[in-house]
């Protein structure tokens, strides 16, 4: 038995920040779980982790230097990533593991979300400003 995950196919981070919502075919209420967001086709970089259980406040952390926060819904976890760089444009995968109560469950690999980071730009100067007037 596997949990199914739905994510937006693509998101654009205009201001170097983005909300990525991971929707699960499973209710996380009163479960102990570990939701994570992974970067790259091989999911090699664990961007952010949201750890939840019944007795503690939600724990959100990144061990890879990302600025992230997380919010929990009954069947979703939303990752809020800030201070993204243009070169962090990539595909991002949601992952979920439910440990308690048993049984242990994890998810079928999702299709992922391409996050396109658009850098902050100043107002562009016109390409052809025309002749300057005296």
């Amino acid at each position: 038995n596997k949990i199914l995950v739905k994510q937006s196919p693509m998101l654009v981070a205009y201001d170097n920040a983005v909300n990525l919502s991971c929707k699960y075919s499973y209710n996380l209420f009163s479960r102990e779980f570990r939701a994570s967001l992974h970067k790259g086709l091989d999911s090699a970089v664990e961007v952010c982790v949201v750890y939840g259980n019944y007795s503690q406040q939600l724990q959100v952390y990144s061990k890879t230097g990302f600025n992230c926060d997380g919010k929990l819904g009954n069947e979703s976890v939303t990752f809020y990533l800030q201070n993204l760089y243009v070169n962090q444009t990539d595909i991002y995968f949601c992952k979920i593991e439910v440990m308690y109560p048993p049984p242990y469950l994890d998810n079928e690999k999702s299709n992922g979300t391409i996050i396109h980071v658009k850098g902050k730009h100043l107002c562009p100067s016109p390409l052809f400003p025309g002749p300057s007037k005296p």
Epitope: S30, N53, Y54, M99, P101, P103, D106
Partner: antibody, heavy 118, light 111 residues
């Protein structure tokens, strides 16, 4: 037949580490969670942690900073490493399989006695 | 952590006796209709052996004289007619919440 065979007894100095192995046979190792439990001499059972079929691990909060559980699917072997050993870690260490998915442990290794002594 | 308290800590009984061991959890171990409470038998120098899982399901190969009952916080292991090979220590275990915990054990001795 279905079995878990553990490595032999170890005598260790305080502050050192120990790594206990648990080799599975007779079942598809990669389909099951393996849990580790210890028992100090004359005492009850204490859960150490587990490794799930996905490769993810989960540890008892009291031992989390010192324990590492790993698995090698190619050899159907699980490992439990405990660092910064102290005398209170002297115990028989067991690996066990969770078959029903409810973390009830149906097959156990024979146990490995780890003695920590200076 | 969920505390499991077994009673009695030890008991003396004769072959053929009906023996009852109780296990009380510090909070409910039920979820979605399942009680995550399991019973083990351990003999000296041996690994524990699973007898009952999910409060009342008899493990394959375990004699039918062993039975488990209960839900919520109160559970019972019953041996309907004690046999010579049943003299051992019995443990309950909960797996509803982490960390997994065990009762302190009940030693069944020969009277």
């Amino acid at each position: 037949q279905v079995q878990l065979v553990q490595s032999g007894a170890e005598v260790k100095k305080p502050g050192s580490s120990v790594k206990v192995s648990c080799k599975a046979s007779g079942f598809t190792f990669s389909s099951y969670a393996i849990h580790w439990v210890r028992q100090a001499p004359g005492q009850g059972l204490e859960w150490i942690g587990s490794i799930y079929h996905s490769g993810s691990t989960y540890y008892s909060p009291s031992l989390k900073s010192r324990v590492t559980i790993t698995a090698d699917k190619s050899t159907s072997t699980a490992y439990m490493e405990l660092s910064s050993l102290r005398s209170e870690d002297t115990a028989v260490y067991y690996c066990a399989r969770d078959v029903y998915g409810s973390y009830a442990l149906d097959v156990w290794g024979q146990g490995t006695l780890v003695t920590v002594s200076s | 952590d969920i505390q499991l308290t077994q009673s009695p800590s030890s008991l003396s009984a004769s072959v053929g006796d009906r023996v009852t061991i109780t296990c009380r959890a510090s909070q409910s171990v039920d979820f979605d209709g399942i009680s995550f409470l399991h019973w083990y038998q351990q003999k000296p120098g041996k690994a524990p052996k699973l007898l009952i899982y999910d409060a009342s399901s008899l493990e394959s190969g375990v004699p039918s004289r062993f039975s488990g009952s209960g839900s919520g916080t109160d559970f019972t292991l019953t041996i309907s007619s004690l046999q010579p090979e049943d003299f051992a220590t019995y443990y309950c275990q909960q797996s509803y919440r982490s960390p997994i915990t065990f009762g302190q054990g009940t030693k069944v001795e020969i009277k």
